[in-house]
Interface confidence: medium
Amino acid sequence: NAKGNYCKRTPLYIDFKEIGWDSWIIAPPGYEAYECRGVCNYPLAEHLTPTKHAIIQALVHLKNSQKASKACCVPTKLEPISILYLDKGVVTYKFKYEGMAVSECGCR
Amino acid sequence: NAKGNYCKRTPLYIDFKEIGWDSWIIAPPGYEAYECRGVCNYPLAEHLTPTKHAIIQALVHLKNSQKASKACCVPTKLEPISILYLDKGVVTYKFKYEGMAVSECGCR
């Protein structure tokens, strides 16, 4: 249904080996990054914190899909993870490697 | 070509009458809102200020399009416009009506 397909956070596990980042990230081997999936149809729900521009774009798209594309479901808040990584051949601890995991999605 | 279809700001003129906002916005009759269109393919260009999460998502999508959706081309910086609007029947001037026009697009 349309509601089930609405913009929301969904699981996305990242395996660093799969993306070739295991060459410099020692640990963890992967992490739950999540992703934002689904549609941003008008009217845009409040919890998706739409900007005025997104509201207008969604409204224009509703009236004329040729004129404007839909607003897009994207991460609006990201969180850090802790990693061990190689820096000049030395294992280094980064307590907050920012912008790695989605905590909130919204329509933009 | 792929480069021409890459994430960028494109014109989108908003006519307030078309979206029914002329009932409360007195002036202007419309404005250039712009929109963000195009693809966010890996590698993501620096001027699109991708988050680490967007880079990872684009990379996963490149390797397995079933596993993750593409990163999305969205407004990353919005600007205000000035409007005259009706507030309880009184015409009011708003010098900065925030979040109305796209000034920058990026991959998120």
Epitope: P28, V90, V91 | -
Partner: antibody, heavy 115, light 111 residues
């Protein structure tokens, strides 16, 4: 050359506090990381915690709130402080340098907890 | 939280090949790097294998590391075992939250 040397008491009374210093030479504590690892007599190795080069500290949750690791970069020293010692804390306490891998260890200090 | 399970002891004869195992109790053994340490009686440990299969300078190529997904185990293989290889061998890996986990150690006796 690279060296790590543990110093501290040989004997600690039960319920007392253990203070060990790891004095390093031949490298900088702002470049390399230092682990604390202990080994009870005839038993295996147990990771206690790590002093990271950037100043962050990680602890083994098994030691709950009784363990504190710190450093003085100007003196090239890393400190281990553990409260409320019991007889089963009797062990050889090692400090070790973590580069890409653990490449240098101290010789260890045997600490006996006994009254 | 997983544990790394090693057999307490193993015996082998000089010149033979021995394979020491390190089984991860839960989770995938291949999901984190495995390290191997050698410790002679009364001495500090030394790293024999890091990142699963890399050898530090000075470690003989008789020592090699591998993993086997089917048994969820890591292995340290020593070819052409020498008398000086008699020691306790510990495996180590990372748990989530970047904590360092050691196995209980295997005492290798060379006959």
């Amino acid at each position: 050359q690279v060296q790590l040397q543990e110093s501290g008491p040989d004997l600690v009374q039960p319920s007392q506090t253990l203070d060990i210093t790891c004095t390093v030479s031949g490298f900088s504590l702002t470049t390399y990381n230092v682990h604390w690892v202990r080994q009870p007599p005839g038993k295996g190795l147990e990771w206690m915690g790590t002093m990271w080069n950037g100043g962050g500290i990680d602890y083994n949750s098994a030691f709950k709130d009784r363990l504190a690791i710190s450093r003085d970069t100007s003196k090239n020293e890393v400190f281990l402080k553990m409260d409320s010692l019991q007889t089963d804390d009797t062990a050889v306490y090692f400090c070790a340098r973590l580069g890409y891998y653990v490449d240098y260890w101290g010789q260890g200090i045997l600490v006996t907890v006994s009254s | 939280q997983f544990v790394l399970i090693q057999s307490d002891s193993m015996s082998t004869s000089a010149g033979s090949t021995v394979k020491l195992s390190c089984k991860r109790s839960t989770g995938n053994i291949g999901s984190s790097y495995v390290y191997w340490y050698q410790q002679h009686e009364g001495r500090s440990p030394t790293t024999m294998i890091y990142d699963g299969d890399k050898r530090p300078d000075g470690v003989p190529d008789r020592f090699s590391g591998s993993i086997d997904s089917s048994s969820n185990s890591a292995f340290l293989t020593i070819n052409d075992v020498q008398i000086e290889d008699e020691a306790v061998y510990f495996c180590q890996s990372f748990s989530s939250g970047i904590k360092f986990i050691f196995g209980g150690g295997t005492k290798l006796t060379v006959l």
